[in-house]
C-alpha cells in the first residue's frame, strides 16, 4: 500500500480494441443522390488505440467511376489514395502510413479504416465519389480523444493535487468539497493536455475531498482522506 | 488485503468501562485514519470517532465526548477504543474501519447489562 | 452534521426485480458515499464505494449512480441472496454519518 501522503490512487481507463464507425448499413444505401448527403462533413470524435472506419456517400458502387480518400494530417503532405473502376487500379500518393487502408477491395468496399488510432491521425478525411450524375463527398475532422491518467495526492497540510496527464482534449477537474483550489494547464507537443488542480481546504470536518474528472472518453472519480494538521490531537464534532 | 481483527465479545455492568481492540494488517498502519462505529441492536449505524496513527490527532463525535478514548499502539499496528461510564443504551456491536471506509472489522459485541 | 435520508426505508421485492433505493445529503450539501449491503449478524459489506465503483467480487447487477446531490443504488434484477439491509455512508464530513437503511422484504 503506498503512503497516504504520498500517490494515494491512479486510474487508466484499460481499452480493448474496439472499433467505431459512421457507415451506414447496406439497407440505407440510396439510388436519390439528391438526398444522400444531409451533411457533408462530420466531426468525429474517436478513441486512441481504437479502430476506425470512415465510409464514402451511400452510393452503390455500380454508378461509380472513380472513389478517392484524400487524407489531410498535421504536418504531413495531403496523401490520397484512389480507385478506378474502368480500369480496376488503385493509386496511392505522399501516403506513408500503414494503418490507413482501404477496408477490403475498393471495388467491393469503398471504406476506409484506421488500425489502431494513434494521435498523429488527427486530421480531415474526405471521400470523393464521381459518379455519371456529378462528384459526392463525405468528409471527417477526426478528433483523436486520448483518456487522461488521473493522480490524486497529498503535498502538504490538508491540501490537494489532482492531476489529469496527457488527456487529450484537457479534462476538466473539479472538486467535492468545493476548495480553495488553483489550476494549471501543460501542453504537450503531441497535442495532450495535463490539468493539474491544487487544493487546499480550511474547515476541518472536511475529512475526506474528492477528485472528479470529466473528459470526453469518460468521467473518473478518485477520493482521499485528509492528514490531521500537524500538533492537532484531540476535537470534538 | 487490508484485515482488521477485533477483540472477542464483552459483558459489562452499567458504569463500567470497556477497551475494543482492533488489530490491522495488510496496509501501512500509520497513514491511514481509523474510524470507530457502532451499531445498537436492530437500529443504524452511527460514528464515534477516528484516529490517524501517525501522529495520534483524534475526532470524537460529540455525543461520546468525555467517554471515550482512542488510541493505537504502532509497533503492533492496534487500534483501541474505551467508552467508560456504560450504560443499557451503549449495547451495541463496535465496528472498526480503516482505508476510507472500505475495511471492517467483525464487529465486537459490548452488552452492557446489570 | 450533514445528515444523511434514504428511501424508502422498506421495500416489498420479489426475484427478477428491479430494485432502487436513494440517498441525499442535508441541505444538498456535496459529498461522497459508499453503499453497503447488511446481513442479520454479520458485518457491513462494502458493494459500491465512491458512488460508483463497483467492488471487486460484487455483482455486476448492483450500481451505483450520482444525480447531483442524489445517490442511487440500483439491483437490476434481484436475486434471493441480495435480501438484507443496505445503507449508505457518507465520508466528505466529519462526523461521517449513515443513512438509516433499506430493508428488503420477499412479497
Known amino acids: 500500500q503506498p503512503n497516504n501522503s504520498l500517490m494515494l490512487q491512479t486510474s487508466k481507463e484499460n481499452h480493448a480494441l474496439a472499433s467505431s464507425s459512421l457507415c451506414m448499413d447496406e439497407k440505407q444505401i440510396t439510388q436519390n443522390y439528391s438526398k444522400v448527403l444531409a451533411e457533408v462533413n462530420t466531426s468525429w470524435p474517436v478513441k486512441m488505440a481504437t479502430n476506425a472506419v470512415l465510409c464514402c456517400p451511400p452510393i452503390a458502387l455500380r454508378n461509380l467511376i472513380i472513389i478517392t480518400w484524400e487524407i489531410i494530417l498535421r504536418g504531413q503532405p495531403s496523401c490520397t489514395k484512389a480507385y478506378k473502376k474502368e480500369t480496376n487500379e488503385t493509386k496511392e500518393t505522399n501516403c506513408t502510413d500503414e494503418r490507413i487502408t482501404w477496408v477490403s477491395r475498393p471495388d467491393q468496399n469503398s471504406d476506409l479504416q484506421i488500425r489502431t488510432v494513434a494521435i498523429t491521425h488527427d486530421g480531415y478525411y474526405r471521400c470523393i465519389m464521381v459518379t455519371p450524375d456529378g462528384n459526392f463527398h463525405r468528409g471527417y475532422h477526426l478528433q483523436v480523444l486520448v483518456t487522461p491518467e488521473v493522480t490524486l495526492f497529498q503535498n502538504r497540510n490538508r491540501t490537494a493535487v489532482c492531476k489529469a496527464v496527457a488527456g487529450k482534449p484537457a479534462a476538466h477537474i473539479s472538486w467535492i468539497p468545493e476548495g480553495d483550489c488553483a489550476t494549471k494547464q501543460e501542453y504537450w507537443s503531441n497535442g495532450t493536455v495535463t490539468v493539474k488542480s491544487t487544493c487546499h481546504w480550511e474547515v476541518h470536518n472536511v475529512s475526506t475531498v474528492t477528485c472528479h474528472v470529466s473528459h470526453l472518453t469518460g468521467n473518473k472519480s478518485l477520493y482521499i482522506e485528509l492528514l490531521p494538521v500537524p500538533g492537532a490531537k484531540k476535537s470534538a464534532k | 488485503q487490508v484485515q482488521l481483527v477485533q477483540s472477542g465479545a464483552e459483558v459489562k455492568k452499567p458504569g463500567a468501562s470497556v477497551k475494543v481492540s482492533c488489530k490491522a494488517s495488510g496496509h501501512t498502519f500509520t497513514s491511514y485514519w481509523m474510524h470507530w462505529v457502532r451499531q445498537a441492536p436492530g437500529q443504524g449505524l452511527e460514528w464515534i470517532g477516528n484516529?490517524?496513527?501517525?501522529?495520534?490527532?483524534?475526532n470524537y463525535d460529540e455525543k461520546f465526548q468525555g467517554r471515550v478514548t482512542m488510541t493505537v499502539d504502532t509497533s503492533t499496528s492496534t487500534a483501541y477504543m474505551e467508552l467508560s461510564s456504560l450504560r443499557s443504551e451503549d449495547t451495541a456491536v463496535y465496528y472498526c474501519?480503516?482505508?476510507?471506509?472500505?475495511?471492517w472489522g467483525r464487529g465486537t459485541l459490548v452488552t452492557v447489562s446489570s | 452534521d450533514v445528515q444523511m435520508t434514504q428511501s424508502p426505508s422498506s421495500l416489498s421485492v420479489s426475484v427478477g426485480d428491479r430494485v432502487t433505493m436513494t440517498c441525499q445529503a442535508s441541505?444538498?450539501?456535496?459529498?461522497?458515499l459508499h453503499w453497503f449491503q447488511q446481513k442479520p449478524g454479520k458485518a457491513p459489506k462494502l458493494l459500491i464505494s465512491?458512488?460508483?465503483n463497483l467492488e471487486d467480487g460484487v455483482p455486476s447487477r448492483f450500481s451505483g449512480s450520482r444525480y447531483g446531490t442524489a445517490f442511487t443504488l440500483t439491483i437490476s434484477s434481484l436475486q434471493d441472496e441480495d435480501i438484507a439491509t443496505y445503507f449508505c455512508?457518507?465520508?466528505?464530513?466529519?462526523?461521517?454519518?449513515f443513512g438509516q437503511g433499506t430493508k428488503l422484504e420477499i412479497k
Open positions: 441541505q444538498g450539501t456535496p459529498i461522497n
Open positions: 465512491g458512488a460508483s
Open positions: 484516529i490517524y496513527p501517525g501522529s495520534g490527532s483524534i
Open positions: 474501519l480503516t482505508m476510507t471506509g472500505t475495511s
Open positions: 455512508l457518507q465520508f466528505t464530513y466529519i462526523p461521517w454519518t
